[in-house]
């Protein structure tokens, strides 16, 4: 059974990924960004399911397309570089759904925008955090 | 124990096609980025393709864009190269790789399968 | 393409020698860093990533070091077993790219 200290640094992890994800979406819908029009070209995957920490393994393999098109913005919409700034988030992921997850992710049949990609996975961010609190 | 077993190489000559295979035991196949690394005789390493785990997303080098193919059976625990239109640069020995994420290091290597492309 | 050149290309050392390889990226890749072994006939081997880090099982007289555009990996004291051929390989952005390869050698 998840230990109060266990639960708390899931939610603070989550909380982390959230603000993550939160800031490439303000990055990205900055209304200086000349790029966004080609950006939303880019075609995503879905997850069919998204409701339980293991399901983060849909996102990991997204991480690297997403990583490409953010390569496409401005550098200065972003803290981080965009290698480094999905590094983190990778790490952040990696730790929150385990390494020892035998969960094969499904996709949705159709594919997302970014900003519809994003949403979705602060929606998944958000509803866990607000299961833990 | 964690191990990957490539087979297929052989001889082919110019223009023709060979399907390598690795195959994969002692852990979570589908929860990893899987890659194709080849090595020319005498020569360096040359990272070749990447696939997903879930095998939605692949990535190739541009010496083999359109030529070569990776893909994946998770329930089989195997990955793939479809090789077609083979040259003699083509000539290497084929090691498949686990990556510990996609664009990772490559953290787990097969023994290698040799692939001579010659008339 | 990220260009990744080591130095020297070869090198004669005696056991129990500290030897230093060392490469360099043709731009910045921060510490996206990997260091492998390999030994003829055989398939390389993960020695260290992300520039410092050491893999599990690795002896801990391999160590990594550099960021940026330049990186050392040391032998702080050279074992028979550790003749071979050492790569760097960077994982910044594709197409991932290797070092042309260092050759460690009996002096």
């Known amino acids: 059974a998840p230990t109060s200290s266990s639960t708390k640094k899931t939610q603070l992890q989550l909380e982390h990924l959230l603000l993550d994800l939160q800031m490439i979406l303000n990055g990205i819908n900055n209304y200086k960004n000349p790029k966004l029009t080609r950006m939303l070209t880019f075609k995503f995957y879905m997850p069919k399911k998204a409701t339980e920490l293991k399901h983060l393994q849909c996102l990991e393999e997204e991480l690297k397309p997403l990583e490409e098109v953010l390569n496409l913005a401005q550098s200065k919409n972003f803290h981080l570089r965009p290698r480094d700034l999905i590094s983190n988030i990778n790490v952040i992921v990696l730790e929150l759904k385990g390494s020892e997850t035998t969960f094969m992710c499904e996709y949705a049949d159709e594919t997302a925008t970014i900003v519809e990609f994003l949403n979705r996975w602060i929606t998944f961010c958000q509803s866990i955090i607000s299961t833990l609190t | 124990e964690v191990q990957l077993l490539e087979s297929g190489g052989g001889l082919v000559q110019p223009g023709g096609s060979l399907r390598l295979s690795c195959a994969a035991s002692g852990f979570t196949f589908s929860t990893y980025a899987m890659s194709w690394v080849r090595q020319a005789p005498g020569k360096g390493l040359e990272w070749v393709s990447t696939i997903s785990g879930s095998g939605v997303r692949t990535y190739y080098a541009d010496s083999v864009k359109g030529r070569f193919t990776i893909s994946r059976d998770n329930s089989k625990n195997t990955l793939y190269l479809q090789m077609n239109s083979l040259r003699a640069e083509d000539t290497a020995v084929y090691y498949c790789a686990r990556e510990t994420y996609i664009y990772g290091p490559f953290d787990v290597w097969g023994q290698g399968t040799l692939v001579t492309v010659s008339s | 393409d990220i260009q990744m050149t080591q130095s020297p290309s070869s090198l004669s050392a005696s056991v129990g020698d500290r030897v230093t390889i060392t490469c360099r990226a043709s731009?910045?890749?921060?510490?996206?860093l990997n260091w492998y072994q390999q030994k003829p006939g055989k398939a390389p081997k993960l020695l260290i990533y992300?520039?410092?880090s050491l893999q599990s099982g690795v002896p801990s007289r391999f160590s990594g070091s550099g960021s940026g555009t330049d990186f050392t990996l040391t032998i702080s004291s050279l074992q028979p077993e550790d003749f071979a051929t050492y790569y760097c390989q960077q994982s910044y952005s594709a197409p991932l790219t290797f070092g042309q390869g260092t050759k460690v050698e009996i002096k």
């Open positions: 992300d520039a410092s």
């Open positions: 731009q910045d890749i921060s510490t996206y």
